[in-house]
């Protein structure tokens, strides 16, 4: 990996678990400049592998609301608008980091957690397995 | 929102910016149980809107490595294996949270940051706009 010199202005850490426990500023900086969310907002409907979005809420997690994609069909939509079962709609999944309140119900203490979320769906050729 | 009673065993926060600055345990808890990553790992190749994955590395960010999807074609792959330009491959984007070292190069001080990543691609019917 890349070694970076430590900034002398860094806060001290007296925590015995350092570097496992760190200070995090929750004042979110949004780097998503020049993006037009409207453009991708309707892909879930226009896709050949359309999906529905389900709200997953957990007050012990930050962010507390996460949207999960569920593919509408097993097959994909063909040119005639019908479901074609020769192809399959599959979820595209991504591992994301969230903050979990630990101990529970604490406003200022968290633990990093890795969760798998389905972001949308794509249309794939199924792999054929010959079974006995 | 849901109000949760505060746990009396919570750590104290003497930070003047509380609750903006919190303690986070970086010992990641992985909730991805019963998932088979092999199943979705080759969707990028089998999709009708295939994509390539590009490594984005930033030592000032946690996680330092993020994989970005770039659609291979403007069109989608048809049943004959050719690119069909009546349809479009588009990236499915998701906003994710990362930790940014702040001040820079500090090992134990971070700020939450929201970034937009492309997770994969899906095949959509293009919207036709009639312009003058």
């Amino acid at each position: 990996g890349i070694t970076i010199p430590r900034n002398p202005g860094c806060p001290n850490s007296e925590d015995k678990n350092f570097p496992r426990t760190v200070m995090v500023n929750l004042n979110i900086h949004n780097r998503n400049t020049n993006t037009n969310p409207k453009r991708s907002s309707d892909y879930y409907n226009r896709s050949t592998s359309p999906w529905n979005l389900h709200r997953n809420e957990d007050p012990e997690r930050y962010p507390s609301v996460i949207w999960e994609a569920k593919c509408r069909h097993l097959g994909c939509i063909n040119a005639d608008g019908n479901v074609d079962y020769h192809m399959n709609s599959v979820p595209i999944q991504q591992e994301i980091l969230v903050l979990r309140r630990e101990p529970p119900h604490c406003p200022n203490s968290f633990r990093l957690e890795k969760i798998l979320v389905s972001v949308g769906c794509t249309c794939v050729t199924p792999i054929v397995h010959h079974v006995a | 929102g849901i109000t949760i009673p505060r746990n009396p065993g919570c750590p104290n926060s003497e930070d003047k910016n509380f609750p903006r600055t919190v303690m986070v345990n970086l010992n990641i808890h992985n909730r991805n149980t019963n998932t088979n990553p092999k199943r979705s790992s080759d969707y990028y190749n089998r999709s009708t809107s295939p994509w390539n994955l590009h490594r984005n590395e930033d030592p000032e960010r946690y996680p330092s490595v993020i994989w970005e999807a770039k659609c291979r074609h403007l069109g989608c792959i048809n049943a004959d294996g050719n690119v069909d330009y009546h349809m479009n491959s588009v990236p499915i984007q998701q906003e994710i949270l990362v930790l940014r070292r702040e001040p820079p190069h500090c090992p134990n001080s971070f700020r939450l940051e929201k970034i937009l990543v492309s997770v994969g691609c899906t095949c959509v019917t293009p919207i036709v706009h009639h312009v003058a």
Epitope: V124, I127, H129 | -
Partner: nanobody, 116 residues
Framework: QVQLVESGGGLVRTGGSLRLSCSVS????????MGWYRQVPGRQRELVAM????????YYADSVKGRFTISRINANNTIYLQMNNLKPEDTAIYYC?????????MGQGTLVTVSS
């Protein structure tokens, strides 16, 4: 591991009927389907009929609509394909399939021969 056990193929005269059955065991998700493909040697495999595991939605190839009926007994994950008014062009090896999103499991096949 998915396992498929097929039965019910055979020789039948034009206009006759046959019933195929197939039982599936193993990991079955809520977003899966069971069905039948058929193949004539040297030709492309054709999806004949399919039934969704939980929704019960059915799909039929145009060539068999009105003649073939797919049904399912949920309790033991068994599907049936009732084939009526059979034609010589229905002659093929019929494969029971279990389709999980992205993966298609196919049985060993059962031969259906329709003689004129």
């Amino acid at each position: 591991q998915v396992q498929l056990v097929e039965s019910g193929g055979g020789l039948v005269r034009t206009g006759g009927s046959l019933r195929l059955s197939c039982s599936v065991s193993g990991d079955i998700s809520s977003q899966s389907a069971m069905g039948w493909y058929r193949q004539v040697p040297g030709r492309q495999r054709e999806l004949v009929a399919m039934i969704h595991t939980t929704k019960g939605d059915t799909y039929y190839a145009d060539s068999v609509k009105g003649r073939f009926t797919i049904s399912r007994i949920n309790a033991n994950n068994t599907i049936y394909l009732q084939m009526n008014n059979l034609k010589p062009e229905d002659t093929a090896i019929y494969y029971c399939t279990h389709n999980e999103p992205g993966d298609l499991y196919m049985g060993q096949g059962t031969l259906v021969t329709v003689s004129s």
